[in-house]
């Protein structure tokens, strides 16, 4: 899943890890654009064995995962412009 | 070579515990992600449990939430599993074998010749 | 959780006969799928992963395919050493193995 917030007033990673998790292994994605008093673009994975991890932004698998749910979320339609969410 | 070897299955009785190693060669172990897998003729095969390259991250079926535990030692190129509470349907097969590769490539999947648990009075 | 509904659960065919076996998802598992082959009393060994990409090793008359929920197996020419039993693995969330498809010598 994977949800775009547009509201966060501040920066929420202190510190970003580019370590590989499979993609089997992640419950939900939330990206926070820069922005509202964040000046980077963040990106927290939720894990299904309930721990929470920063991830850079750069980090390859990670952008490769963007991508297919980029893809995935052309093809549905649109929903509200503050929150977009991708099974 | 790649070789993943198991030790540590036998019989238990219900509620007691075991230790299942599987010792590696023939690749960089502190590389690949890690995973158990058992086997029974009624339920086929089913994943277990799942490790992180470092050990810090450990992913687990729900029926051995809270009983299981995987661990590694890359330094010995080891892989763990501590079962605990044991059951009769934890009776199996128990398999070690590979994951994804640091940079999720997926190319190795080379499997232990596996261990056998029985749990039983 | 995701089930994968494999099948059939026994295939009897001959030497040369094309088979198929069949895996389906209970939700979409954007092709994240592997199949495996079992001989007795040995550990599984990867024929494909990703749907459709052959393992190094194994020999062309194996290829996958399938997309969304529904993924098969295909043998195009059966030889004396692919009876074996044959499974498959949903790699979208956690880890579901199929119940497995026992190929027998008709």
């Known amino acids: 899943v994977l949800e775009v917030y547009y509201t966060h007033l501040r920066c929420r990673c202190v510190q970003e890890s580019s370590v590989f998790i499979p993609r089997r292994f992640i419950d939900r994605i939330q990206i926070s654009p820069r922005g509202n008093g964040c000046p980077r673009k963040e990106i927290i994975v939720w894990k299904k064995n309930k721990s929470v991890v920063c991830v850079d932004p750069q980090a390859e698998w990670i952008q490769r995962i963007m991508e297919m749910l980029r893809k995935k979320s052309s093809s549905t339609p649109p929903v509200p412009v503050f929150k977009r969410k991708i099974p | 070579e790649v070789q993943l070897v198991e030790s540590g299955g036998g019989l238990v009785q219900p509620g007691g515990s075991l230790k299942l190693s599987c010792v590696v060669s023939?690749?960089?172990?502190?590389?690949?992600?890690m995973a158990w897998v058992r086997q029974t003729p009624t339920k086929g095969l089913e994943w277990v449990a799942s490790i992180n390259y470092d050990g810090g991250d450990t992913y687990y079926r729900d029926s051995v939430k809270g009983r299981f535990t995987v661990s590694r030692n890359n330094a010995k190129s080891s892989l763990f599993l501590q079962m605990d509470s044991l059951r009769s349907e934890d009776t199996a097969t128990y398999y070690c074998k590979t994951e994804e590769d640091y940079d999720g490539s997926y190319v190795m999947d080379a499997w232990g010749q596996g261990a056998s648990v029985i749990v039983s009075s | 959780d995701i089930q994968m509904t494999q099948s059939p659960s026994f295939l009897s065919a001959s030497v040369g006969d094309r088979v198929t076996i069949s895996c389906k998802a209970s939700?979409?598992?954007?092709?994240?799928l592997t199949w495996y082959q079992q001989k007795l009393g040995k550990a599984p060994k990867r024929l494909i992963y990703?749907?459709?990409i052959l393992q190094t090793g194994i020999p062309s008359r194996f290829s996958g395919s399938g997309s969304n929920t529904d993924y098969t197996l295909t043998i195009s020419s059966l030889q004396p050493e692919d009876f074996a039993t044959y499974f498959c693995?949903?790699?979208?969330?956690?880890?579901?193995f199929g119940a497995g498809t026992k190929l027998e010598l008709k």
């Open positions: 990703n749907t459709n």
């Open positions: 023939g690749f960089t172990f502190s590389d690949y992600y």
């Open positions: 939700q979409n598992i954007n092709k994240e």
């Open positions: 693995l949903q790699q979208s969330s956690l880890y579901t």
